[in-house]
């Protein structure tokens, strides 16, 4: 028998520095977690103690904090190189700055192979990107070889900016021939490493013949055997065992997100490459694990540029950006409109001639808007200003909801109106009329939404049974501010870009902004 230790991360999302327990900015260092310096300590400890160790990443290193905004992926390559990762799969967010923003910062600068079997380049890009990412890589581990085959969510064109010259194929269809190829090369231990979410990970384990282990990402899935060490609730045991169609027991793992845990899986193979046993658990990277001093020093060196960036002008406003709770928790506020407009702008994807865009709607809890921005400071808007407006380090995500769920959400928005509560929704691509004289749960008297399957966008009444795409904060997607109906009834949820980054990019693009209060949210009394 031959034993392999798989260490794995996924959806790190730019958390290079240690964070608080909820993966936001670290405030009290003695209670902070994660970060590459702490990760390195644990990885090195395991490498010294065990003979056959692979360190793998299942994608979405890009996007999430000011580190990515400033360094654009160079920080990912630098610190992953320093940790000596063995391989990485491409995630959807690796395409956030287009293909050019992936090639030089990461693909060419990484010292490790970057993988995806289901992304195929065409046209002029094919020659430019040839060999920069691979469908699979055979890695020598001790006296054996292990094949790693990569995959990426086929939804990436809707979630990021891969352009028109990359085709995202069905994962299972694309993986099978690559695994077959590895078999012909006499590679009998094969790991599928990828970024398509837990449901797809399980399908790959079930359907792709020859895959021995699946290491996934995208869905931020937390798996754990025994009593979990922090706040995350396990979605199942670690590893999650899937019985394949050909009768094998295939372990599937994921390690939550944000570098809070290091996945730790021990696999025992027989001489023919069959999995005999698998066990392990994610390791919580809490403050009991010291930060490596040399990596920490490097982090501090790279940090300097971030502090300078925070005070640079992104653009100008010529109007007061009203982000006060007195406005945003009671009525339409222009800060809410600005943020929603930025959210939609960030999700412009012309993927189908029938649609001017795949999504037109935005909702945003007024309680998430934490500060106004005064235009009387020469109109200057900085990252620092935006960090005061959006201090929670959230993301703006894409969900699919039925009209009936949206209607419930808008009823919830005003069910206890007047108490300055955070659930009052700011909107984009939506016209809503409330009648507060009616009883809670029956106050939405008009709800019109902007069409997407149209060449000239216009507002049509919401249809209860229709499925709509909506951009909203991850806080709402997770049922925050009492929006349990969103969490319970959403049909799809894909995590998006860092909230501040979305707004800062929009302001930089527009250069000068002047958002108005324009009648997106109205109040009426009496008949309609």
């Amino acid at each position: 028998a031959w034993e392999l230790t798989i260490l794995h991360t996924n959806d790190v999302h730019s958390r290079l520095e240690q964070t608080s327990e909820d993966s936001s900015k670290c405030v009290n260092a003695s209670r902070c977690m994660g970060g590459v310096a702490r990760l390195f300590t644990k990885v090195q400890q395991i490498r010294r103690a065990e003979p056959n160790v692979l360190l793998l990443d299942a994608g979405d290193q890009y996007q999430g904090t000011i580190w990515f905004t400033v360094y654009k992926g160079a920080e990912v390559a630098h610190f992953m190189n320093a940790l000596r990762y063995d391989a990485m799969a491409l995630g959807n967010h690796e395409f956030d700055n287009g293909v050019e923003g992936l090639i030089e910062p990461l693909l060419k600068e990484a010292k490790f192979p970057i993988l995806s079997a289901n992304i195929k380049a065409k046209g002029p890009l094919a020659s430019q990107i040839s060999g920069l990412y691979l469908p699979y890589k055979v890695l020598p581990v001790g006296d054996e070889v292990v094949g790693i085959v990569g995959y990426t969510s086929k939804e990436t064109p809707f979630l990021s900016n891969p352009g028109t010259n990359l085709v995202f194929e069905d994962e299972i269809t694309a993986l099978q021939p690559e695994v077959d190829k590895l078999k012909t090369l006499n590679v009998n231990k094969i790991i599928a490493l990828g970024h398509s979410g837990f449901e797809m990970d399980k399908l790959i384990a079930q359907k792709v013949r020859g895959v021995d282990v699946v290491v996934g990402g995208h869905s931020n899935t937390f798996l754990y055997t025994g009593n979990p060490p922090s706040k995350e609730v396990p979605a199942g045991k670690y590893p999650f065992i899937v019985t394949s169609d050909d009768g094998r027991k295939v372990p599937v793992v994921q390690a939550y997100a944000f570098g809070k845990y290091l996945g730790y899986l021990k696999i025992e193979f027989d001489e023919r490459g069959n999995v005999i046993s698998s066990h392990g658990n994610p390791i919580l990277l809490n403050s009991s694990i010291p930060e490596d001093p040399s990596i920490k020093a490097d982090i501090n060196k790279w940090r300097i540029k971030l502090d300078n960036y925070s005070t640079q002008e992104l653009g100008k406003t010529i109007v007061y950006l009203d982000g006060s709770s007195q406005s945003c928790r009671f009525r339409e506020c222009n800060m809410g409109n600005l943020i929603c407009d930025a959210m939609i702008n960030n999700n412009l994807r012309h993927t189908d001639e029938m649609f001017w865009n795949h999504v037109s709607m935005c909702i945003l809890n007024g309680g998430g808007i934490r500060s106004p921005i005064d235009e009387r400071n020469n109109g200057t808007i900085t990252w620092e200003n935006l960090a005061a407006v959006l201090p929670f380090g959230g993301t703006f995500d894409l969900v699919q909801l039925k009209g009936s769920t949206l209607k419930k959400a808008f009823e919830h928005s005003v069910h206890r109106y007047g108490q300055s509560t955070g659930e009052f929704l700011q909107v984009g691509g939506i016209h809503v009329v409330y009648d507060l004289s009616r009883k809670p749960g029956d106050r939405v008297v008009k709800l019109d939404v902007l069409c997407t399957k149209c060449r000239v966008p216009s507002y049509d009444p919401l249809k209860m049974d229709e499925v709509y795409k909506v951009i909203l904060p991850n806080f709402l997607a997770n049922g925050g501010d009492g929006f349990q109906m969103i969490k319970d009834e959403l049909l799809r949820h894909d995590s998006g870009d860092q909230d501040i980054n979305v707004v800062s990019t929009y302001i930089s693009k527009m250069k000068v902004i002047y958002p108005a209060v324009e009648g997106r949210i109205k109040f009426s009394t009496g008949s309609h």
């Epitope: 654009k72 030089e104 060419k108 600068e109 010292k111 430019q128 060999g131």
Partner: antibody, heavy 119, light 107 residues
Framework: QVQLVQSGAEVKKPGSSVKVSCKFS????????FSWVRQAPGQGLEWMGR????????DYAQKFRDRVTITADESTSTAYMELSGLRSEDTAVYYC????????????WGRGALITVSS | DIQMTQSPSFLSASVGDRVTITCQAS??????LNWYQQKPGKAPKLLIY???SLETGVPSRFSGSGSGTSFTLTISSLQPEDFATYYC?????????FGGGTKVDIK
């Protein structure tokens, strides 16, 4: 196909500066990094530094940090290496090199420029 | 800086010989090592990257092995066109450093 064309040989006086150019063609300039490697007559290879134009980042060998400046001009797809305070031991062939697949291995080289430092 | 020590510095061999060149790193560099061939008056040519991966178009008689601090370039059957100088290069850390070179000439 992708290639690097370097400027020609030069003779320089001690204490002066030299600026060697490396013109890139046949691909997307922003998808590459450019390293400078020198080789004194009958000696081995010595890496001086590099630039990643799209990120405007440079890395230099400590030995040359005070005297070398590597720059790039995206409009002409050209990388430059300027070495100041020349001395006789700087007489060498100066190569510009790049990687087609990774920035860490050089599968693309210019023909080299012989810089002779002599009074 | 990481020191790369190549041995031997000079090597005389005949066509058809099996030739082995070693490269020692002053610290662990994992598999972050490349091999180049250089002929007089020409730029170096990449042969092997990542310690053991054969560059496209390079004959299969060239192979590389090793990890950590000890690396080897092997030419299984020396051909007339292989008489040249060979360099190893580490890319574990800046500055990138080369070995002193091994000159292979005709016995």
């Amino acid at each position: 196909q992708v290639q690097l064309v370097q400027s020609g040989a030069e003779v320089k006086k001690p204490g002066s500066s030299v600026k060697v150019s490396c013109k890139f063609s046949g691909g997307s300039f922003t998808s590459y990094s450019f390293s400078w490697v020198r080789q004194a007559p009958g000696q081995g290879l010595e890496w001086m530094g590099r630039i990643i134009p799209v990120l405007t980042t440079t890395d230099y060998a400590q030995k040359f940090r005070d005297r070398v400046t590597i720059t790039a001009d995206e409009s002409t797809s050209t990388a430059y290496m300027e070495l100041s305070g020349l001395r006789s031991e700087d007489t060498a062939v100066y190569y510009c090199a790049s990687g087609l697949k990774k920035n860490w291995y050089f599968d693309l080289w210019g023909r080299g420029a012989l810089i002779t430092v002599s009074s | 800086d990481i020191q790369m020590t190549q041995s031997p510095s000079f090597l005389s061999a005949s066509v058809g010989d099996r030739v082995t060149i070693t490269c020692q790193a002053s610290q662990d560099i994992s598999h972050y090592l490349n091999w180049y061939q250089q002929k007089p008056g020409k730029a170096p040519k990449l042969l092997i990257y990542d310690a053991s991966s054969l560059e496209t178009g390079v004959p299969s008689r060239f192979s590389g092995s090793g990890s950590g601090t000890s690396f080897t370039l092997t030419i299984s059957s020396l051909q007339p066109e292989d008489f040249a100088t060979y360099y190893c290069q580490q890319y574990d850390d800046f500055p990138l450093t080369f070995g002193g070179g091994t000159k292979v000439d005709i016995k």
